[in-house]
């Protein structure tokens, strides 16, 4: 059978300051069991952008409905973009465990921020 893939279709996204950025991510399977998280950057210093379970992420909303069954769309929207938000964003599938372990990452989407139109 096919192993789960994490698909980030956009290599790059450009957004004007003050607008919202949509970062697309889909997975190809419901299993293995475990959560999806979003990060900016890679490696041990990466910054957690969204985790459904813990944390407070007031600028992040999920694109799919909160009651959607068998959801495989893990796209997010980040509001009120500023130049400080520029970077590469990764959608990462974790395998459930104690603790959860990283299973597969998307290829990343580079977010660039344009100056606010005057």
């Amino acid at each position: 059978e096919e192993e789960l893939q994490v698909i980030q279709p956009d290599k790059s996204v450009s957004v004007a300051a003050g607008e919202s950025a949509i970062l697309h991510c889909t997975v190809t399977s419901l299993i293995p069991v475990g959560p999806i998280q979003w990060f900016r950057g890679a490696g041990p210093a990466r910054e957690l952008i969204y985790n459904q379970k813990e944390g407070h992420f007031p600028r992040v909303t999920t694109v799919s409905e909160s009651t959607k069954r068998e959801n495989m769309d893990f796209s997010i929207s980040i509001s009120n973009i500023t130049p400080a938000d520029a970077g590469t964003y990764y959608c990462v599938k974790f395998r459930k465990g104690s603790p959860d372990t990283e299973f597969k990452s998307g290829a990343g989407t580079e977010l660039s921020v344009r100056a606010k139109p005057s």
Partner: antibody, heavy 120, light 108 residues
Framework: DVQLLESGGGVVQPGGSLRLSCAAS????????MTWVRQAPGEGLEWVST??????YYADSVKGRFTISRDNSKNTLYLQMNSLRAEDTAVYYC???????????????WGLGTLVTVSS | EIVLTQSPATLSVSPGERATLSCRAS??????LAWYQQKPGQAPRLLIY???IRETGIPARFSGSGSGTEFTLTISSLQSEDFAVYYC??????????FGGGTKVEIK
Amino acid sequence: DVQLLESGGGVVQPGGSLRLSCAASGFSFSNFAMTWVRQAPGEGLEWVSTIGSGDTYYADSVKGRFTISRDNSKNTLYLQMNSLRAEDTAVYYCAKDSTVSWSGDFFDYWGLGTLVTVSS
Amino acid sequence: EIVLTQSPATLSVSPGERATLSCRASQNVKNDLAWYQQKPGQAPRLLIYAARIRETGIPARFSGSGSGTEFTLTISSLQSEDFAVYYCQQYYDWPPFTFGGGTKVEIK
């Protein structure tokens, strides 16, 4: 129509072994996690084990004694039960996992169950 | 492990009356809670998921509410086929998945 049919239950002595099967139809079996839940006579529901693809999860009460597995080519879920104890006596249900949005799993279809009795 | 406590253990209700069943979680489970109905000799049946969403085919007289640690299943007007045992289940933090001890709804 989703159907789950358990088999393999019966009477076994303490310390013995039994292998339960659950034949699934009516959905893409390989795409879903599957779960075993048991119910002792006159008692409530107790989660036993869940399997995703290669990932398996067990209740502490059965860890090291029970093994969950699946054969996607046969659309079948298994539960190998070793070192059985009197307290394992229960109806064993297999259930299909479902998810909502970014959350965990609940169970949207259940089989009719198979009774396992551990007694000398 | 998250403990779910259901109350009352038994609820005696007349047909046509409203039944209110409670499920309390030992810690916050957000909306990650399901309700099941089980009749004697039968498998459980999913009624409600995500605390308030009715499963396809479940009559509108069943409704779920609550979030965090306090949840309610309401049956607005009990029909004869509704007399059964009802279980809540949390799927916020697992393993283990945990179920409440059940509430038996019996005919008054």
